[in-house]
């Protein structure tokens, strides 16, 4: 019969014949021959291969280095890599999460729009009119100015994006 020019799914062409690929989690030991099947063996304890393959070596699982602020989010298997994330209060510097940096704080005049996660930094927003933030924080949102009216008081000092209004007693009308 004519040697194949293309092979079916889960196969590869070598020496004019179709050999079975190794399944995810296994590596190639030897190609098939006319008389034998492809020989594959499972990856070792700290290794993985995540695709149908003909790799002779498995990949090492990623190491989540605590010195870089990393910890294991999901332990790797023979078919998947380890997923790292950052310790509390830190976030990844890249999508690959190879190192971590401290979450940024929002300065006075700015509030937290979105709290940081292990993979994204704090998102700050300027406090709009009617709101303020007088602290540097990674958690605090902008607070609304105090409503003097509801307390039967009057504004003695206007609020800013960094300070609350100051309320005071209403001036008594003199007889």
């Amino acid at each position: 019969p004519e040697p194949p020019t293309a092979c079916r799914e889960k196969q590869y062409l070598i020496n004019s014949q179709c050999c079975s690929l190794c399944q995810p989690g296994q590596k190639l030991v030897s190609d098939c021959t006319e008389f034998t099947e492809t020989e594959c063996l499972p990856c070792g304890e700290s290794e993985f291969l995540d695709t149908w393959n003909r790799e002779t070596h498995c990949h090492q699982h990623k190491y989540c280095d605590p010195n870089l602020g990393l910890r294991v989010q999901q332990k790797g298997t023979s078919e998947t890599d380890t997923i790292c994330t950052c310790e509390e209060g830190w976030h990844c510097t890249s999508e690959a999460c190879e190192s971590c940096v401290l979450h940024r704080s929002c300065s006075p005049g700015f509030g937290v729009k979105q709290i940081a996660t292990g993979v994204s930094d704090t998102i700050c927003e300027p406090c709009p009119v009617g709101f303020f933030s007088n602290v540097s924080s990674a958690f605090e949102k902008c607070h609304p100015w105090t409503s003097c009216e509801t307390k039967d008081l009057v504004v003695q000092q206007a609020g800013t994006n960094k300070t609350d209004v100051v309320c005071g007693p209403q001036d008594r009308l003199r007889a």
């Epitope: 079975s20 989690g25 296994q26 034998t36 099947e37 492809t38 020989e39 063996l41 499972p42 078919e79």
Partner: antibody, heavy 121, light 106 residues
Framework: QVQLVESGGGLVKPGGSLRLSCAAS????????MSWIRQAPGKGLEWVSY????????YYADSVKGRFTISRDNAKNSLYLQMNGLRAEDTAVYYC??????????????WGQGTLVTVSS | SYELTQPPSVSVSPGQTASITCSGE??????ICWYQQKPGQSPVLVIY???KRPSGIPERFSGSNSGITATLTISGTQAMDEADYYC?????????FGGGTKLTVL
């Protein structure tokens, strides 16, 4: 005709030990990966252990890890299973089986007739 | 630990097609083997690497595997096909068997 013959089964008390043997004939034993599989009475198949051609790669089921040891002697065309710390739940027919010479991609294409291990006080 | 799930029993009339399923997480990412075991006998490999038949196994036995389900199909089922059938796969560094399916030929 390719043949695998198990021996060494029998009645043993809990905590006891047994050594099963599997004699291979009519094929080049050293060319094949080998496994032990067991089947409790009236139950399904359960894989026990696996050994590569040269014996340098070995895997065990969690249920037997630390208690059972698989080995082979290619010069004697023999596969062994040393079973220590036996428990009632180890009671089963133990089969030795030959892999299709494809490591972890083939199937078990030749099985012995099995040897019964009974663990009871 | 990884699990393969099979229906406990399947019935078929002689000459009809029997389908026995085996399901498991990411099963299409693994090679599946099928074994036939008759009462009092040792298992016999009928399909390996999803669809391949060892020599001596009749053409009426075929296999497929995709997604989370592998299927053993016996076309033109005969009385002699009545047996228990087990699927098997490698997961990580362990071999896993399904619980077995009893095929009854009515």
């Amino acid at each position: 005709q390719v043949q695998l013959v198990e021996s060494g089964g029998g009645l043993v008390k809990p905590g006891g030990s047994l050594r099963l043997s599997c004699a291979a004939s009519e094929f080049t034993f050293s060319d094949y990966y080998m496994s032990w599989i067991r089947q409790a009475p009236g139950k399904g198949l359960e894989w026990v252990s696996y050994i590569s051609r040269s014996g340098d790669t070995i895997y065990y089921a969690d249920s037997v890890k630390g208690r059972f040891t698989i080995s082979r002697d290619n010069a004697k065309n023999s596969l062994y299973l040393q079973m220590n710390g036996l428990r009632a739940e180890d009671t089963a027919v133990y089969y030795c089986a030959r892999d299709l010479a494809a490591g972890a991609t083939g199937g078990l294409d030749c099985w012995g007739q099995g040897t019964l291990v009974t663990v009871s006080s | 630990s990884y699990e393969l799930t099979q229906p406990p029993s399947v019935s078929v009339s002689p000459g009809q097609t029997a389908s026995i399923t085996c399901s498991g997480e990411r099963l299409g990412n693994k090679y599946i083997c099928w074994y036939q075991q008759k009462p009092g006998q040792s298992p016999v490999l009928v399909i390996y690497q999803d669809f391949k038949r060892p020599s001596g196994i009749p053409e009426r036995f075929s296999g497929s595997n995709s997604g989370i389900t592998a299927t053993l199909t016996i076309s033109g089922t005969q009385a002699m096909d009545e047996a228990d059938y087990y699927c098997q796969a490698w997961d990580s560094r362990t071999v896993v068997f399904g619980g077995g399916t009893k095929l009854t030929v009515l």
